[in-house]
């Protein structure tokens, strides 16, 4: 028969046959012949592969280094990698999760719109009329302005975007 | 810094039981693979089992089945080993230790001396 | 279970000397760990997965093999280097260490 030229999923082309690819958390010995089966071996503790492969060395799990300030979220198996995550207060700097920054901080004028998470930053938002933000926060949201009226009062110092309305005492009208 | 440090030596009479400890610092318990190794006096290392912190999953050398009993306290970062039934020839000293990662490359304790005397 | 043969179990090197020690499995291992033991002292793991250098070990060592055999090798003996050297799979349950090898200095 003609030797094949593409082989079926799950299998790889190798001195004309096709062979069984390794699966997940194991690596390749030796190929396959025509009388013998591909030979595979697992992957050892601290090691992993993720996909089925023809790979002759498995690959060392990440190493969440808390000197960067991550921390293992997902400890690895022999088929899949450790998974990092960023200690309280940062983020990680890439989808990767190599290293972490601390969490952004919102200024006054401005409000949180989403709160950091171990892969993402701090979302701002500038704080609209009627609302506002005295203090630099990761986690403050834009305040609205004391309503003078609900309290028997009336405005005496518009608010701004970094200052609540202060509110005073009613004029009394003389008779 | 990172430490392992294990409780201090014991002596115990025949047919007793021990329990050692392995506090680590520095890292958070679940992170890793505990196991443990024991060294007779004179002797080469002898692997006798491991303990996943992070959901109590052990497997031991059969050798130590039914002698050693692994487990561990993630709230205080703490590993034990019970050893039952204790003959001389469980005289050794024995040490927990890490699984690894590239940039820790294994911690280990300073062992604990294990002496069965009557 | 995997049973670790290592050779030699006990030698001697003058200062200078190349060192290999060795350590056959009974079926193929994914790698193999070694450590040094000195008197008195916990292990060490000195090198992982086969043949990468743990950190502060001195670039004379070195490690390799596949399958069932391995080696650690010492391209020039020093003095700090005596101690004993163990091999252990971390591959199939129960996890195995060699028998040790013994190396002191002449």
């Known amino acids: 028969p003609e030797p094949p030229t593409a082989c079926r999923e799950k299998q790889y082309l190798i001195n004309s046959q096709c062979c069984s690819l390794c699966q997940p958390g194991q690596k390749l010995v030796s190929d396959c012949t025509e009388f013998t089966e591909t030979e595979c071996l697992p992957c050892g503790e601290s090691e992993f592969l993720d996909t089925w492969n023809r790979e002759t060395h498995c690959h060392q799990h990440k190493y969440c280094d808390p000197n960067l300030g991550l921390r293992v979220q997902q400890k690895g198996t022999s088929e899949t990698d450790t998974i990092c995550t960023c200690e309280e207060g940062w983020h990680c700097t890439s989808e990767a999760c190599e290293s972490c920054v601390l969490h952004r901080s919102c200024s006054p004028g401005f409000g949180v719109k989403q709160i950091a998470t171990g892969v993402s930053d701090t979302i701002c938002e500038p704080c609209p009329v009627g609302f506002f933000s005295n203090v630099s926060s990761a986690f403050e949201k834009c305040h609205p302005w004391t309503s003078c009226e609900t309290k028997d009062l009336v405005v005496q110092q518009a608010g701004t975007n970094k200052t609540d309305v202060v509110c005073g005492p009613q004029d009394r009208l003389r008779a | 810094e990172v430490q392992l440090v294990q409780s201090g030596a014991e002596v115990k009479k025949p047919g007793a039981t021990v329990k050692i400890s392995c506090t680590v610092s520095?890292?958070?318990?679940?992170?890793?693979?505990i196991h443990w190794v024991k060294q007779r006096p004179g002797k080469g290392l002898e692997w006798m089992g491991r303990?996943?912190?992070?959901?109590?999953?052990?497997k031991y050398d059969p050798k130590f089945q039914g002698k050693a009993t692994m487990t561990a306290d993630t709230s205080t970062d703490t590993a034990y080993m019970e050893l039952s039934s204790l003959r001389s020839e469980d005289t050794a000293v024995y040490y927990c230790?890490?699984?690894?990662?590239?940039?820790?490359?294994?911690?280990w304790g300073q062992g604990t001396t294990v002496t069965v005397s009557s | 279970q995997i049973v670790l043969t290592q050779s030699p179990t006990i030698m001697s090197a003058s200062p200078g000397e190349k060192v290999i020690i060795t350590c056959s499995a009974t079926?193929?291992?994914?790698?193999i760990l070694w450590f040094q033991q000195k008197p008195g002292t916990s292990p060490k793991l000195w090198i992982y997965?086969?043949?990468n250098l743990a950190s502060g070990v001195p670039a004379r060592f070195s490690g390799s093999g596949s399958g069932a055999s391995y080696s650690l090798t010492i391209s020039r003996m020093e003095a700090e280097d005596a101690a004993t050297y163990y091999c252990?799979?971390?591959?199939?349950?129960?996890?195995?260490f060699g028998g040790g090898t013994k190396l002191e200095i002449k």
């Open positions: 252990q799979q971390r591959t199939f349950y129960p996890y195995t």
């Open positions: 079926s193929s291992v994914s790698y």
């Open positions: 303990i996943d912190p992070e959901d109590g999953d052990t």
């Open positions: 997965s086969t043949s």
């Open positions: 230790t890490t699984s690894y990662y590239v940039g820790t490359y294994g911690y």
């Open positions: 520095g890292f958070n318990i679940k992170d890793y693979y």
